[in-house]
Each structure stands twice: as C-alpha cells, then as structure tokens.
C-alpha cells in the first residue's frame, strides 16, 4: 500500500466542501523521487491538489472540493506510472442531507392481529441510510409523564409503518408515540402522539344481506330494498354507529350515502331508489359515541328494487 | 363506585317463570351491554344472555332460548331477565354483569339464587 | 360454538410458588381470552383482559400471555388470598363460553 486517503468527513451534506489528503510512503522505491499525485472524483480529474515533502521524506497531496454534488462518488489519488493511471487509495464519499422531521404519524388498533399499526411520511430524500424507529412508553396520565418503555420498533428497510404487538400494549390507558429518524448527519423526531390504543380502534365491517322475506311481511315496496347485516362478532361488544351507500350498477353515478345508522339497527329498509334498477350497496361502521376510526366498506351487496306496481291510466301524456 | 345489585330469585317449580332485576349505578347504564352468566351449584359458569346499550341486540345460550328475554329499562338503570318455562337445569345462581367493549365481564353483581324444584 | 378447555382442573401449590394455568380454544380467537378468579360464595373478579392486560387494582404478579387458540394465565408467586378457582372466557363471539374451571388449593 503506496498511498493512503483521508478525508475532512466521508459524509457531508450535498453541496459542502470537503478536504482530502493523500500520502505516499518513501519506501515506494519504484516512485518517482518527485511523484505528481494527481486526484479524480469519479471519472473526472481534478485540479488544485497542494503537494508537499514532508520531513519524514514522504509525499502529501491536499485537495479540497468547494462543493460535493454528488450523493455517492469515490475520490482516489493516483500516480501516472507509464502510460496509465496508477490509483493508490480511493475512498467513498457520501452526500445528502439530515432527516426531516417524519409527519402525519398516525396509528389503528388492529383487535385482528392485536397489534397497533402506526404508519408516518418520512419526509424527502435524504440520499443516505436512514433509520426510523417508532418509539413510545406507558402514561398513565395524558403522556407528559412517562412511565414504562416499550421496547423500540423498527420497520422493514424502506417501510413507514411498524406494529407494536399486544404484548406491548395497554388498552384504556394512553401511550405517547412518536417516530424518530436517524442518519450520518443528524437525528429528527417527529411531534408525540398521545393516544388510547381503543380511541383508534378500526373495526372490521358488517356483512350486508338481503332480508329473508317472512311469509307475514309485506314485500318491499318498488323503489325500496330491504337489508339486513350481521356485525363483526369480535366487535360486538363496542357501540358503533354506521352508514350504508349505495349506486345504480349501471351508469356514472357516485355513490349516496345513507347514515347514521345504529349497528343495532341491524335490518333496514332503504327507499326512495329507482325501481327495477340492479343497486350496489356497501357498509362500514366506526366506534361511537367513544373515538375510533372509521372501517372499510364491506363487500358489496347487489339487489334489484322491484318493479313499480302496474297503473291504471289508460291515457298516457307525452310531452 | 360501579355496583350492580340482583334481586327476584328464589324457589319456584318447574315450568314456572321468574323474573329477575339488576339494578345498576355508578356508571352511565345506557352506554354498556349488560349480561347473565349463572352457576349451577358446585359447577362452572355458563353464559345466559346479554343485551347491547339500546336493547336492538339479545344473544341467548342455546339453552334459554325462547324460554328466557333479557330486557333492560335505560331510564330506570335496570336489567331483566324474564324466565319462563323453568326447569330443574335452570337451578343457579344468577349474575348479572356489565360487558367490557372487547366481551369481558367487569363488574359482577353479588349473585341471586334461583331454585327451580318441585 | 367455542369450547373453551381449562388444565389443569385442580392444582395444589405452596405459597411463593409460581402457578400456570392454560386455556386452549377450539379454533383461533385471536386475543380475546379473559381470566376471572372466584372465591367459594362469592362472585366472579376480573383479573385479566383481552389475553394480557392486567384489569385496574390487580396485583402484577397476575399475568396473561397467549393469542389464537393458547393463552395461560401465570401467577409469578402465589400469596395465600390467592387460593381460589380460575375461569377463563372467550369473548371472539356468541355465544360467550367459560373454561370449566382450574382449583388451586393449598398444598
């Protein structure tokens, strides 16, 4: 080993300068007595490297590059032995810029997987490995003390979502939570949520059915379908209101929404509908009057309302 | 303090009815399911029947049903459980229960007996 | 409907040891296992929710673990008011159904 780098910082943030000096032992016999040490970035040569004999016979070439503006490139010093390019060390430069502050965290509690599910935006690039960590503790209070840690999740490379398993988990009690980011040139956190793992609680929705027709009832009226759903038995327990929508199969219309109904509502009957028209109609249900997040739709159900009933006009008026 | 207290047990003969009541304070009654779970003497519990916080949902044990109607009167803070058709089986201690958002029972009432015997 | 099954149905321990009951459902419920404690004569307390949350007011040496169809309830070291029958509940849907029971009586 003739030569050896080092560098001010082999990771800087893009667009900063950045000093490198280059040695060569005397003992390279083979060398020129003056070598030149010449200097490349990538591909490209570089001038302005300052060269010195040091008193222990050694060279030393100092270079400075006014502005990094690439994120990954590798500096080498090289000799010119012959016709070619001898390259005696080479070192990688990292540039980019320290992470910003991760937004929009927010979290569902998942009674499925009985995990709570928190998901965040990273913020732009910062051409760097960057590490999140999705951090929080137990709070009995509303999370300006803290109590136990829970121990620290981390995401899949390249992810914005991590779940914290039951384990870890206390429901009715608050939890502070909040993502904090990491790489060479800096640390950020993202602001504390404050939260309940119930008051963020996603239900699974109903199952939409028609209504079995009862020999004693009277059948739907045209323009009007009759429905029933059966609720998410594990979230049967947990108050909910909810909303159907419904649209024509056919055609460009959007969907109208029909709501609030009482998940106990649990049968319906929904008028005011074209007649003989083929409808789509979904629900989905949320944690009421105590906070929760809204859950999927539920697969669609596809009735046709009936037809209307037959007229007795004889005449009938065009206009 | 959360308290629920029963009352309406006591002997009657088979295919008599009964009607128990479960008085509830220290909460706000009309926002919980409310439920019975019994005990026969020297056995384990058995789930009855419970009833969501408007009354629109009463699931039933297969071994009350149509025999047995949970009610609930939200502006009394009071529970029912209408017994009809009693049978010796049905000899237990009643509890009535207030349901937890994720199906647990907390708290229970102290327990009314019902003894159906001839 | 979900059998719930309790083992074992009768233990005999010593205080300070440390106890383990387990409950194993018929088919997956995920975490929706409670565990009651209940002394001869009176009713039933809650001491764990949800496979593993400790209800407000019980002692942490009760604990819960568990999810699908196996869970235990642990009790690190047994004190003597802990002397009593142990029901587990499945509450994933109706109808709610207990375990038979665990005794755990004084060796």
């Known amino acids: 080993e003739c030569g050896h780098i080092s560098v001010s910082a082999p990771i800087v943030h893009l667009g900063d300068p950045i000093t490198a000096s280059c040695i060569i032992k005397q003992n390279c016999s083979h060398l020129d007595p003056e070598p030149q040490i010449l200097w490349r970035l990538g591909a490209e040569l570089q001038p302005g490297g300052r060269q010195q004999r040091l008193s222990d016979g050694t060279q030393e070439s100092i270079i400075t590059l006014p502005h990094l503006n690439h994120t990954q490139a590798f500096l080498s010093c090289a000799l010119n032995w012959g016709n070619s390019l001898q390259i005696l060390d080479q070192v990688e430069l990292r540039a980019g810029y320290p992470p910003a502050i991760p937004h929009n965290l927010s979290c569902l509690m998942n009674l499925t997987t009985s995990s709570l599910i928190c998901q965040w935006e990273p913020g732009p690039e910062t051409h760097l490995p960057t590490s999140f960590t999705l951090k929080s503790f137990k709070s009995r209070g509303n999370c300006q003390t803290q109590g136990d840690s829970i121990l620290d999740c981390v995401p899949k490379d390249g992810q914005s979502h991590c779940s914290i398993p039951r384990k870890h988990l206390l429901l009715y009690q608050n939890m502070g939570i909040w993502v904090q980011a990491e790489n060479a040139l800096g640390t950020s956190m993202s602001p504390q949520l404050c939260l309940d793992p119930m008051d963020v609680v996603a239900l699974e929705p109903p199952m939409l059915r028609t209504m079995d027709p009862s020999p004693e009832a009277a059948p739907p009226q045209a323009g009007c379908l009759q429905l029933s759903w059966e609720p998410w038995q594990p979230g049967l327990h947990i108050n909910q209101k909810c909303e159907l929508r419904h649209k024509p199969q056919r055609g460009e219309a959007s969907w109208a929404l029909v709501g609030p109904l009482p998940l106990e509502a649990l049968q319906y009957e929904l008028c005011g509908l074209l007649p003989a028209t083929a409808y789509t109609l979904q629900i989905r249900c949320i944690r009421w009057p105590l906070p929760g997040h809204w859950s999927d739709w539920s697969p669609s159900l596809e009735l046709r309302t009936t037809e209307r009933a037959p007229t007795h006009h004889h005449h009938h008026h065009h206009h | 303090e959360v308290q629920l207290l029963e009352s309406g047990g006591g002997l009657v003969q088979p295919g008599g009815s009964l009607r128990l009541s479960c008085a509830a304070s220290?909460?706000?009654?009309?926002?919980?399911?409310m439920g019975w779970v019994r005990q026969a003497p020297g056995k384990g519990l058995e789930w009855v029947s419970s009833?969501?916080?408007?009354?629109?949902?009463?699931p039933y044990a297969d071994s009350v049903k149509g025999r047995f109607t949970i009610s609930r009167d939200n502006s009394k803070n009071t529970l029912y459980l209408q017994m009809n058709s009693l049978r010796a089986e049905d000899t237990a201690v009643y509890y009535c229960?207030?349901?937890?958002?994720?199906?647990?029972?907390?708290?229970w009432g102290q327990g009314t007996l019902v003894t159906v015997s001839s | 409907d979900i059998q719930m099954t309790q083992s074992p149905s009768s233990l005999s321990a010593s205080v300070g040891d440390r106890v383990t009951i387990t409950c194993r459902a018929s088919?997956?419920?995920?975490?929706?296992l409670n565990w009651y404690q209940q002394k001869p004569g009176k009713a039933p307390k809650l001491l764990i929710y949800y496979a593993s949350n400790l209800q407000n007011g019980v002692p942490s040496r009760f604990s819960g673990s568990g999810s699908g169809t196996d869970f235990t309830l642990t009790i690190s070291s047994l004190q003597p008011e802990d002397f009593a029958t142990y029901y587990c509940q499945q509450s994933y849907s109706t109808p709610l159904t207990f375990g038979g029971g665990t005794k755990v009586e004084i060796k």
């Open positions: 009833i969501s916080s408007s009354g629109g949902v009463t």
């Open positions: 220290g909460f706000t009654f009309s926002l919980y399911w």
């Open positions: 229960a207030k349901l937890g958002e994720l199906g647990w029972f907390d708290p």
């Open positions: 088919q997956g419920i995920s975490s929706y």
